[in-house]
């Protein structure tokens, strides 16, 4: 017979020869990192038809790392389903907990023994320090010193000393999130008041108010014979300015060769612009949309 077969999990005892006589026996042993479990044979004989009798390495099993329990408030997941060396053990924590230690352990061979590459990690409860205090405002649970995962606080602004109230800029509610950090930056309390929006040759059609505070929204239309240059809708932003800026109502050019000043809309524009009140969706001037409006 020629050289005996080779296996992944077992190796020949002694040196292999180029040729073997009929009836000659060769013995195998489990390779390093594997151990033998009977009853499968670990030898073979050169048969009279010059082939080796059937043999396999199925009696050699990989060395296994010790079983690791799920961490408290977490889970250990075997990446390839067994504890044999070469295995990966992935650790995850339950919601509201974070991992202290390595999130992956590897089953490694040390000499002939399979051991894990490190200590299993722990799952600790996510805790946040108190959220920031803010000027001219406060948050709920201000007496609490430690916050747990998903604990939320709500900010509110103090009454203003003057005639205009403080506006809350940002998120009013924030919660203790992953990485023990708050979900958003603390908001700001300040007076935000935009100027009265004056549009010559036009008028406000919605968003009427005594004063215009944070996020107040106003819409305009132009008089007949004028068109809107800019946006018909503006919002009072945190820096006390209108965004987009207060529009202008510009006179319609009746000459077909003269271009009206550019409007804020993109794309090609006609050289003659009809008055805004002729656009679809705009009330006609004689419809008296402001009559009998309750603010």
């Amino acid at each position: 017979c020629e050289a005996p077969p080779t296996f992944e999990a077992m190796e020949l005892i002694g040196k292999p020869k180029p040729y073997y006589r009929v009836g000659e026996r060769v013995d195998y042993k489990c390779k390093k990192g594997y151990f033998y479990i009977p009853p499968l044979a670990t030898h073979t004989i050169c048969d009279r038809n010059h082939t080796w009798l059937p043999v396999s390495d199925e009696g050699c099993y990989r060395e296994m790392c010790p079983h690791i329990r799920d961490p408290l408030n977490g889970e250990a997941i075997l990446a390839n389903g067994s504890y044999e060396f070469g295995a990966e053990l992935h650790f995850i924590c339950n919601e509201g907990y974070y991992l202290i230690g390595k999130d992956i352990l590897y089953c490694e061979l040390k000499d002939t023994v399979a051991i894990w590459s490190g200590k299993p990690p722990l799952c600790e409860k996510i805790l946040c320090t108190p959220p920031p205090k803010i000027k001219n405002g406060k948050h709920t649970f201000s007496e609490v010193e430690v916050f747990e995962y998903l604990d939320a606080v709500t900010y509110s602004c103090d009454p203003a000393p003057g005639p205009d109230p403080f506006s809350l800029i940002g998120e009013s509610m924030i919660y203790c999130g992953n990485n023990s950090t708050w979900s958003h930056a603390a908001p700001e309390c300040k007076v935000v008041k935009c100027r009265f929006p004056v549009v010559e040759n036009g008028k406000q059609i919605s968003g009427f108010g005594k004063k215009f505070y944070y996020k107040a929204t106003v819409m305009f239309e132009c008089d007949k014979g004028y068109y809107l240059n800019g946006s018909d809708k503006i919002v009072c932003e945190s820096n006390s300015t209108w965004d987009p800026p207060v529009p202008k109502c510009l006179k319609v050019s009746t000459s077909p060769t003269t271009k009206s000043p550019t409007s804020s809309a993109s794309g090609p524009r006609p050289t003659y612009k009809p008055p805004v009140s002729n656009y679809p969706g705009y009330p006609k001037p004689d419809e008296g949309i402001l009559n009998n409006l309750d603010d």
Epitope: K193, F196, L290, N291
Partner: antibody, heavy 118, light 107 residues
Framework: EVQLVESGGGLVQPGGSLRLSCAAS????????ISWIRQSPSRGLEWLGV???????NYNSAFMSRFTISRDDSKNTAYLQMNSLKTEDTAVYYC????????????WGQGTLVTVSS | AIQLTQSPSSLSASVGDRVTITCRAS??????LNWYLQKPGQSPQLLIY???SLHSGVPDRFSGSGSGTDFTLKISRVEAEDVGVYYC?????????FGQGTKVEIK
């Protein structure tokens, strides 16, 4: 609290010109929106125009061609330049601080009398 | 321009009376209406802004109401110091305009 004082009124012939001044004390004229308003027995109260803090202006179109509002920050004074004056322009002229950017008038001065007569 | 028409043009009341002055706009002005009082020999003074908000220092016997085109100024118990000419003013649209005035006298 800013105080506005009007001056420059007087007798002027029809067709003549006059420049009224509005001097600010206790504050900067450039920090406020300044309106000019006039009052006469025949025409009542009439708003003439405004100069905003950013230097922009709006006018009552009835006076736009003859009246101009300006401001000199170095002199801390706002002005109303009136040209081609008519007898019906005879009135008390007030400069008025627009209330905190809102068109209500809470700060009236004593006004200055302009008489247009030959 | 938006016209404001006040009525009555003048009225005479006794101290303690309730006085009502109306202001009608030629088109809807939402609540963008102010009221002023010009006492004899003085400059006008702001009483009420945005239809019903009392300016600082104004006694609470003054009140304003209305919306759209019809507005009212009420003095619940008129006093001698309330004599003068009352003006309304709109500011929804340029030019900002005033009513012709209502003269209030004390009997």
């Amino acid at each position: 609290e800013v105080q506005l004082v009007e001056s420059g009124g007087g007798l002027v012939q029809p067709g003549g010109s006059l420049r009224l001044s509005c001097a600010a004390s206790g504050g900067s004229v450039s920090s406020y929106d300044i309106s000019w308003i006039r009052q006469s027995p025949s025409r009542g109260l009439e708003w003439l125009g405004v100069i905003w803090t950013d230097g922009g202006t709006n006018y009552n179109s009835a006076f736009m061609s003859r009246f101009t509002i300006s401001r000199d920050d170095s002199k801390n004074t706002a002005y109303l330049q009136m040209n081609s004056l008519k007898t019906e322009d005879t009135a008390v002229y007030y400069c008025e601080r627009v209330y905190d950017g809102y068109p209500w008038f809470a700060y009236w001065g004593q006004g200055t009398l302009v008489t247009v007569s030959s | 321009a938006i016209q404001l028409t006040q009525s009555p043009s003048s009225l005479s009341a006794s101290v303690g009376d309730r006085v009502t002055i109306t202001c009608r706009a030629s088109q809807g002005i939402s609540n963008y209406l102010n009221w002023y009082l010009q006492k004899p020999g003085q400059s006008p003074q702001l009483l009420i802004y945005y239809t019903s908000s009392l300016h600082s220092g104004v006694p609470d016997r003054f009140s304003g109401s209305g919306s759209g085109t019809d507005f009212t100024l009420k003095i619940s118990r008129v006093e001698a110091e309330d004599v003068g000419v009352y003006y309304c003013q709109q500011y929804i649209k340029l030019p900002w305009t005033f009513g012709q005035g209502t003269k209030v006298e004390i009997k």
